[in-house]
């Protein structure tokens, strides 16, 4: 393709300034918002190369990539319009190259501004500015090992870019992977550079190779899928926890109870009450207040701890972790013992609003 | 500016079926994949179906599995949903939706269109 | 399919309120969670993708994090025009499947 590098003018007119480079119709590069534009700088010998957008010096940054004679925007705006130059410098003399970028939708009048993923590589339709493949969002690939229960879906990604578009394919331990080679097949998105397997079972264990390559070169990536076969049991509860505790009056104390479960378990918090003198109901079931379950701001790692602050001898009794999954329900419950503070009466306080369960 | 635009709903009896189109403008259509979601009255959001840019992907909710069709014209700029053998379960407020490129979140949506299954 | 929850399935603030709504998958999607409004009549409009990342025009109050099955968006102080319904959609397996809805009311 042509060069379109500055070349020495020597037909300047004496009025207009002296300059050394006339350009000499650069070429534009056309990019929508959000997608990632690459360019070559198309110097010769360019050892130290400096770039520069509408004269100024340009540095790298989170989304500006300057490699070698690579120039890479990722998740392009209308902002990154402009005329750039790369300079490639040497011992004798420099040499400065031009080009245009223009960021806009070629059908949408430029307002389609909010496609800030940067996933897709991007190269203008009408340049030469070929490239063997190259992974664009390396961050989607770093978890290498996936070990995944049985009957979930698993999804491997490999975001690749190049010119011209890289096609990808997929191995299974080094071989096609066929769909036929898995009851139910895969789902391969190509425009998300993904494959998908639903309802995983022990013999979709493996390697997975991703191998993403154009007429300029070839990548791959693997993956190992180790598939953990469901145990049907409910949760199961940590031996001697919650632990029967004591505290005096206006202490602090904490209830600790660690679940261990396959299918996902809600976990509560209860305490056993007495109603009108009695512990059980007429039917024989016993009074219960739920003090803590998962909700809006609870984690499964806060919920496996229940703090008591300021303890009254109202908190006295029977704690009970409960923890329930689609098999079943386990619970295990512990003591808490509240000893009167040296020289203060025993507190009274109202008695709280009751569940029944 | 990127607009999308429903049309093809109205009442149809149990049984029977109906086409939905979705006229996009204001974007390359072809380099976007395109989505279906619907709205029962209400009620929440149910994804219904996805198509490729380039068509040659497609995959349906279980519900809607064997009786709706998903695909599109890229030379008419337009997303097509065919839904056969409809049941009352299927009467919500359609929508077609733009996939951001790579992250299939919703970027876009049409104003939607009203499918309402009643004998 | 992959399910997902959301807690609480309404609630109620005030303006300048910080509002946290949260979403479960019931298996690990990794970071493929998005985050939608919707108002009465309206088609629902994107606020957060991938998790975390802002969509363009969205107001810096609305954030979104988490990761594998638990995610959260926060509406840092709640204004006026946020009072709506917000859904939550994970893409991370071929059906793209939303959370039932959160509604966020005027107390």
């Known amino acids: 393709r042509p060069s379109f590098s500055l070349v020495e003018d020597t037909t300047l007119e004496p009025e207009e300034p002296p300059t050394k480079y006339q350009i000499s119709q650069p070429e534009v590069y056309v990019a929508a918002p959000g997608e990632s534009l690459e360019v070559r700088c198309l110097l010769k010998d360019a050892a130290v190369i400096s770039w520069t957008k509408d004269g100024v010096h340009l540095g790298p940054n989170n989304r500006t990539v300057l490699i070698g004679e690579y120039l890479q925007i990722k998740g392009a705006t209308p902002r990154d319009s402009g005329l750039y130059a790369c300079t490639a410098s040497r011992t004798v003399d420099s040499e400065t190259w031009y080009f245009m970028v223009n960021v806009t939708d070629a059908i949408s009048s430029g307002d389609d501004e909010d496609d800030t993923d940067g996933a897709e590589d991007f190269v203008s339709e009408n340049s030469n500015n070929k490239r063997a493949p190259y992974w664009t969002n390396t961050e989607k690939m770093e978890k290498r090992l996936h070990a995944v229960p049985a009957a979930n879906t698993v999804k491997f990604r490999c975001p690749a870019g190049g010119n011209p578009m890289p096609t990808m394919r997929w191995l299974k331990n080094g071989k096609e992977f066929k769909q036929e080679h898995r009851i139910g097949g895969y789902k391969v998105r190509n425009q998300h550079w993904s494959l998908i397997m639903e309802s995983v079972v022990p013999s979709d264990k493996g390697n997975y190779t991703c191998v993403v390559e154009n007429e300029y070169g070839s990548i791959n990536h693997t993956y190992h899928l180790d598939v953990v076969e469901r145990s049907p049991h409910r949760p199961i509860l940590q031996a001697g926890l919650p632990a029967n505790a004591s505290t005096v009056v206006g202490g602090d104390v904490e209830f600790v109870c660690k679940v261990y479960s396959d299918a996902q378990p809600h976990i509560q918090w209860i305490k056993h009450v007495e109603k009108n003198g009695s512990k059980y109901g007429p039917d024989g079931l016993p009074y219960l207040k739920v003090l803590k379950a998962a909700g809006v701001n609870t984690t499964d790692k806060e919920i496996e701890v229940l703090y008591i602050r300021n303890v009254t001898f109202e908190d006295a009794g029977e704690y009970t972790c409960l923890a329930g999954n689609s098999i079943g329900i386990s619970f295990h419950s512990a003591w808490l013992t509240v000893l009167p503070a040296p020289g203060r009466e025993k507190e009274i306080t109202a008695s709280p609003d009751y569940l029944e369960i | 500016q990127v607009q999308l635009l429903e049309s093809g709903g109205g009442l149809v009896q149990p049984g029977g079926s109906l086409r939905l189109s979705c006229a996009a403008s204001?974007?390359?259509?072809?380099?976007?994949?395109m989505s279906w979601v619907r709205q029962a009255p209400g009620k929440g959001l149910e994804w219904v179906s996805v198509?490729?840019?380039?068509?040659?992907?497609?995959h349906y909710a279980d519900s809607v599995k064997g009786r709706f069709t998903i695909s599109r014209d890229n030379s008419k700029n337009t997303l097509y949903l065919q839904m056969n053998s409809l049941r009352a379960e299927d009467t919500a407020v359609y929508y077609c939706?733009?996939?951001?490129?790579?992250?299939?979140?919703?970027?876009?949506w049409g104003q939607g269109t009203l499918v309402t299954v009643s004998s | 399919d992959i399910q997902m929850t959301q807690s609480p399935s309404s609630l109620s603030a005030s303006v300048g309120d910080r509002v946290t709504i949260t979403c479960r998958a019931s298996?690990?999607?990794?970071?493929?969670l998005n985050w939608y409004q919707q108002k009465p009549g309206k088609a629902p409009k994107l606020l957060i993708y991938?998790?975390?990342n802002l969509q363009s025009g969205v107001p810096s109050r609305f954030s979104g994090s988490g990761s594998g099955t638990d995610f959260t968006l926060t509406i840092s102080s709640l204004q006026p025009e946020d009072f709506a319904v917000y859904y939550c959609?994970?893409?991370?397996?071929?059906?793209?499947?939303f959370g039932q809805g959160t509604k966020v009311e005027i107390k």
């Open positions: 298996q690990d999607i990794s970071s493929d």
């Open positions: 198509i490729e840019g380039d068509g040659s992907y497609t």
């Open positions: 939706a733009r996939e951001k490129t790579y992250s299939s979140a919703f970027d876009y």
């Open positions: 204001g974007f390359t259509f072809s380099d976007y994949a």
């Open positions: 959609q994970q893409h991370y397996s071929p059906s793209h499947t």
């Open positions: 991938d998790a975390s």
